[in-house]
C-alpha cells in the first residue's frame, strides 16, 4: 500500500497504525495517500520538523500514549487537510507557539493527559475552525484572557482535572457557540459573575469536584439552553434564591456532596424537563413546603445522607411524577401523615437509617403504586393497623433492625407478615426487641402468648388476610432494590470519562443500579 513501514499496519482504507515500544521515531516512508495515522504506545520522545510532509491528505492524526515531551514548531507543516489531531497521554509540558499554524481545517484538538503548565492566546490563534478542544488532565493553573478568543466556532471545551484556582470572567466571552464546558476537578473556589454570560448556546456545564463555596445569584442567567449542570462535590453552603431561575431546559442537576444547610421554597425555579435531582451528602436539616413544587416532571429525588429531622407536610407538593424518593440516613423521628400524599406515582421509597419511632396510619394512603419500602434500621416498635393494606404492587418491604415490641399489639402486623413473607425477602427478617424474654426471636413466627400482654388488646386482625401471589416475577434482577452493586453517584455522561467507578457500597441512596442513572 504505497510503502507501509515495517513497524506499522496499513489498511485499504488509507489507515495507518504504528504501535510498539521499539518505535523511537516517526516511521518512514508513510503511504502518501494515508488519511488516518495512529502512533500509539511507542517510545517516541520528540517530533522534529515536518515528519508528515509527504502525507498532506491526512485527515486524522493520533499520537497518543507515547513518551513525547518535545515538539518542533513545524512538526505539523503541510497538514492543511487535518481535521482531527490528538496528542493525548504524552509528556508534553510546553507547546511551541505556532505549532498549529497552517492547520486551517482542524476541528478537534486533543491535548489531554499531558503535563502542560500553561497555554497562551497565541497557541490557538490560527485554529479558527476548531470545534473541540480537550485540555483536561494537565497542570494548568491559570487561563489567560484571550486564550480562546479566536475559537469562535468551538462547541466543546474540556478544562477538567487541572489545577485552576480561578477563572477570569472574560476568558469564555467569545465562545457563543460553545455547547459543552467542563471545568470539573480543579481548585476553583468561586466563579465571578458574568463568567458564563457569553455562552448562550451552552448545554452542559461541569463544575463538580472543585472548592466552590458561593454561587453568584445571576451566574447562569444567560444560559437558557443549559441541559446538564454538575455542581456536586464542592463546598456550596447556600443557594441564592434566583440562581436556577432561568434554566428551563435543565434535565440534569447534581448538587450532592456539598454543604447545603437549607433549601428555600421555589429555589428550583421552573425546570419542566428535570428528571433527577441529586442532593445526597449535604447538611440539609429540614424541607419546607413547596421546595420542589416547580419540578413537575421529576422522577428521582435523592435526599439521603443529610441531617433532615423535619419535613413539612407540603414539602413534596408538585412532584406528581416522582418514582423514586430516597430519604435514608437522615435524622427523621416523625413524619406527617400527609407528607407523601401528592406522590401518586411513587414506586420506591427509602427511609432506612433514620430515627423513626412510629408511622402515621395514613402515611402511604395515596401512594398506591408503591413497589418497595425500606424501613430497616429505624426505631419502630409497631406499625399502625392496615398501613400496607392497599399496596397491591408492594413486592419489597424491609423491616429488620427495628426494636419491635412483641406484645399482643403486634399480632395484626405479625399475621400480615406471615401471609406476605415473600415481600420481606429471605436475607434478613425482623426480630423482636422487647419484651426481653422474646428478644431476638423472629417477629413472623413469635408466639405472642409468651410475651407480656399489652394494656390494650386490639381485635385481630385488620391486615389483609389474603396471601400475596405476584402475577409476574416479583422484581426483575436489573432493578432489584436490594441489588448489591450500585453506582455511588450518577454517571455524568462523559465521552471522555475513562472509568465509571462501581462499588458494592449500598449506602448512597438505597436504590438500584438501573435507577441510579
Amino acid at each position: 500500500y504505497h510503502g507501509c513501514p515495517s513497524e506499522c499496519t496499513c489498511s485499504r482504507a488509507s489507515q495507518v497504525e504504528c504501535t510498539g515500544a521499539r518505535i523511537v521515531a516517526v516511521p518512514t516512508p508513510l503511504p502518501w495517500n494515508a488519511m488516518s495515522l495512529q502512533i500509539l504506545n511507542t517510545h517516541i520522545t520528540e517530533l522534529n520538523e515536518s515528519p508528515f510532509l509527504n502525507i498532506s491528505a491526512l485527515i486524522a492524526l493520533r499520537i497518543e500514549k507515547n513518551e513525547l515531551s518535545r515538539i518542533t514548531p513545524g512538526a505539523f507543516r503541510n497538514l492543511g487537510s487535518l481535521r482531527y489531531l490528538s496528542l493525548a497521554n504524552n509528556k508534553l509540558q510546553v507547546l511551541p507557539i505556532g505549532l498549529f499554524q497552517g492547520l486551517d481545517s482542524l476541528e478537534s484538538l486533543l491535548l489531554s493527559s499531558n503535563q502542560l503548565l500553561q497555554i497562551q492566546p497565541a497557541h490557538f490563534s490560527q485554529c479558527s475552525n476548531l470545534k473541540e478542544l480537550q485540555l483536561h488532565g494537565n497542570h494548568l493553573e491559570y487561563i489567560p484572557d484571550g486564550a480562546f478568543d479566536h475559537l469562535v466556532g468551538l462547541t466543546k471545551l474540556n478544562l477538567g482535572k487541572n489545577s485552576l484556582t480561578h477563572i477570569s470572567p472574560r476568558v469564555f466571552q467569545h465562545l457563543g457557540n460553545l455547547q459543552v464546558l467542563r471545568l470539573y476537578e480543579n481548585r476553583l473556589t468561586d466563579i465571578p459573575m458574568g463568567t458564563f454570560d457569553g455562552l448562550v448556546n451552552l448545554q452542559e456545564l461541569a463544575l463538580q469536584q472543585n472548592q466552590i463555596g458561593l454561587l453568584s445569584p445571576g451566574l447562569f442567567h444567560n444560559n437558557h439552553n443549559l441541559q446538564r449542570l454538575y455542581l456536586s462535590n464542592n463546598h456550596i453552603s447556600q443557594l441564592p434564591p434566583s440562581v436556577f431561575m432561568q434554566l428551563p431546559q435543565l434535565n440534569r442537576l447534581t448538587l450532592f456532596g456539598n454543604s447545603l444547610k437549607e433549601l428555600s421554597p421555589g429555589i428550583f425555579g421552573p425546570m419542566p424537563n428535570l428528571r433527577e435531582l441529586w442532593l445526597y451528602d449535604n447538611h440539609i436539616s429540614s424541607l419546607p413546603d413547596n421546595v420542589f413544587s416547580n419540578l413537575r416532571q421529576l422522577q428521582v429525588l435523592i435526599l439521603s445522607r443529610n441531617q433532615i429531622s423535619f419535613i413539612s407536610p407540603g414539602a413534596f407538593n408538585g412532584l406528581t411524577e416522582l418514582r423514586e424518593l430516597s430519604l435514608h440516613t437522615n435524622a427523621l423521628q416523625d413524619l406527617d401523615g400527609n407528607v407523601f400524599r401528592m406522590l401518586a406515582n411513587l414506586q420506591n421509597i427509602s427511609l432506612q437509617n433514620n430515627r423513626l419511632r412510629q408511622l402515621p396510619g395514613n402515611i402511604f394512603a395515596n401512594v398506591n403504586g408503591l413497589m418497595a419500602i425500606q424501613l430497616q434500621n429505624n426505631q419502630l416498635e409497631n406499625l399502625p393497623l392496615g398501613i400496607f393494606d392497599h399496596l397491591g404492587k408492594l413486592c419489597e418491604l424491609r423491616l429488620y433492625d427495628n426494636p419491635w415490641r412483641c406484645d399482643s399489639d403486634i399480632l395484626p402486623l405479625r399475621n400480615w407478615l406471615l401471609l406476605n413473607q415473600p415481600r420481606l425477602g429471605t436475607d434478613t427478617v425482623p426480630v423482636c426487641f422487647s419484651p426481653a424474654n422474646v428478644r431476638g426471636q423472629s417477629l413472623i413466627i413469635i408466639n405472642v402468648n409468651v410475651a407480656v400482654p399489652s394494656v390494650h388488646v386490639p381485635e385481630v386482625p385488620s391486615y389483609p388476610e389474603t396471601p400475596w401471589y405476584p402475577d409476574t416475577p416479583s422484581y426483575p434482577d436489573t432493578t432489584s432494590v436490594s441489588s448489591t452493586t450500585e453506582l455511588t453517584s450518577p454517571v455524568e455522561d462523559y465521552t471522555d470519562l475513562t472509568t465509571i467507578q462501581v462499588t458494592d457500597d449500598r449506602s448512597v441512596w438505597g436504590m438500584t443500579q438501573a435507577q441510579s442513572g
Partner: antibody, heavy 120, light 112 residues
Framework: EVQLVESGGGLVQPGGSLRLSCAVS????????VHWVRQATGKGLEWLGV???????NYNSALMSRLTISKENAKSSVYLQMNSLRAGDTAMYYC??????????????WGQGTTVTVSS | DIVMTQSPDSLAVSLGERATINCKSS????????????LAWYQQKPGQSPKLLIY???TRESGVPDRFSGSGSGTDFTLTISSLQAEDVAVYYC????????FGGGTKVEIK
C-alpha cells in the same frame, strides 16, 4: 453466660489502621446488636457505632469516614476497622450489647476492653 | 450532633448523704409521640467497664438499687443518689439516644 471479649489492640503507627475483634458468646449476632465505645485514659466515653442484628450500621458522624463495623454471624464475631489513625485515637476500646435492657440503644453487657496506642 | 453537658465535673459527698448530678442537652430529648425522653445514665467504677443504671430518663435498669433515681424532661436531667454508699464511688455519664448516641463528659463522685 453472656460474654464479650475484645482483641486486636496494641501499638499502631500514626496513619496506620487497626482491626479490632469482639468475640461474643451466650447470644447470637443474628438477634442482638453490638456497639463499639472507646475511652481515652482519664477521659469520657465516646460512642463509635453499632451493627444491628440484620447487619445495618450506624456510626459516630465525626468518625464515619474512618470507621467500618462488620460481623461474621457464624463466627460470633464483630469487627471494628479504623483507618488513618492519629494520636487522639489512643484509647481503651469496648464492645457492648443490649441483652436485657428495654433501652434499644442501651448497653447492659460490656467487654473488658482492648487498649490501642497510636504512636511512632 | 447533640451535645451533652454534665455538671459538676466532680462531687464529694458524705456517706449516707444525697448526691445530685445534672445533665443538660443541646436540644430536647423528648419525643412528643412516644412521650419518652431518650436519656440514660451509666456508672463506671475505677478499672471497670461502664454499667447501665437508668434509661428513658427515669426507668431503673433491673438490679439497680432504688437509691438511684433519674428525673427531668426535655433538656434538663438529674441523677440522684439518695444515700451515698461506699460502692457508689465512680464516674457517672449521661447519654442521649434521641439522635445517634453521645455521652456527657462525666461526673466523678467521691466520698467526703
Amino acid at each position: 453466660e453472656v460474654q464479650l471479649v475484645e482483641s486486636g489492640g496494641g501499638l499502631v503507627q500514626p496513619g496506620g489502621s487497626l482491626r479490632l475483634s469482639c468475640a461474643v458468646s451466650g447470644f447470637s449476632l443474628t438477634s442482638y446488636g453490638v456497639h463499639w465505645v472507646r475511652q481515652a485514659t482519664g477521659k469520657g466515653l465516646e460512642w463509635l457505632g453499632v451493627i444491628w442484628a440484620g447487619g445495618s450500621t450506624n456510626y459516630n458522624s465525626a468518625l464515619m469516614s474512618r470507621l467500618t463495623i462488620s460481623k461474621e454471624n457464624a463466627k460470633s464475631s464483630v469487627y471494628l476497622q479504623m483507618n488513618s489513625l492519629r494520636a487522639g485515637d489512643t484509647a481503651m476500646y469496648y464492645c457492648a450489647t443490649h441483652m436485657i435492657t428495654e433501652d434499644y440503644y442501651g448497653m447492659d453487657y460490656w467487654g473488658q476492653g482492648t487498649t490501642v496506642t497510636v504512636s511512632s | 450532633d447533640i451535645v451533652m453537658t454534665q455538671s459538676p465535673d466532680s462531687l464529694a459527698v458524705s456517706l449516707g448523704e444525697r448526691a445530685t448530678i445534672n445533665c443538660k442537652s443541646s436540644q430536647s430529648l423528648l419525643n412528643s409521640r412516644t412521650r419518652k425522653n431518650y436519656l440514660a445514665w451509666y456508672q463506671q467504677k475505677p478499672g471497670q467497664s461502664p454499667k447501665l443504671l437508668i434509661y428513658h430518663a427515669s426507668t431503673r435498669e433491673s438490679g439497680v438499687p432504688d437509691r438511684f433515681s433519674g428525673s427531668g424532661s426535655g433538656t434538663d436531667f438529674t441523677l440522684t443518689i439518695s444515700s451515698l454508699q461506699a460502692e457508689d464511688v465512680a464516674v457517672y455519664y449521661c447519654k442521649q439516644s434521641y439522635n445517634l448516641p453521645t455521652f456527657g463528659g462525666g461526673t466523678k463522685v467521691e466520698i467526703k
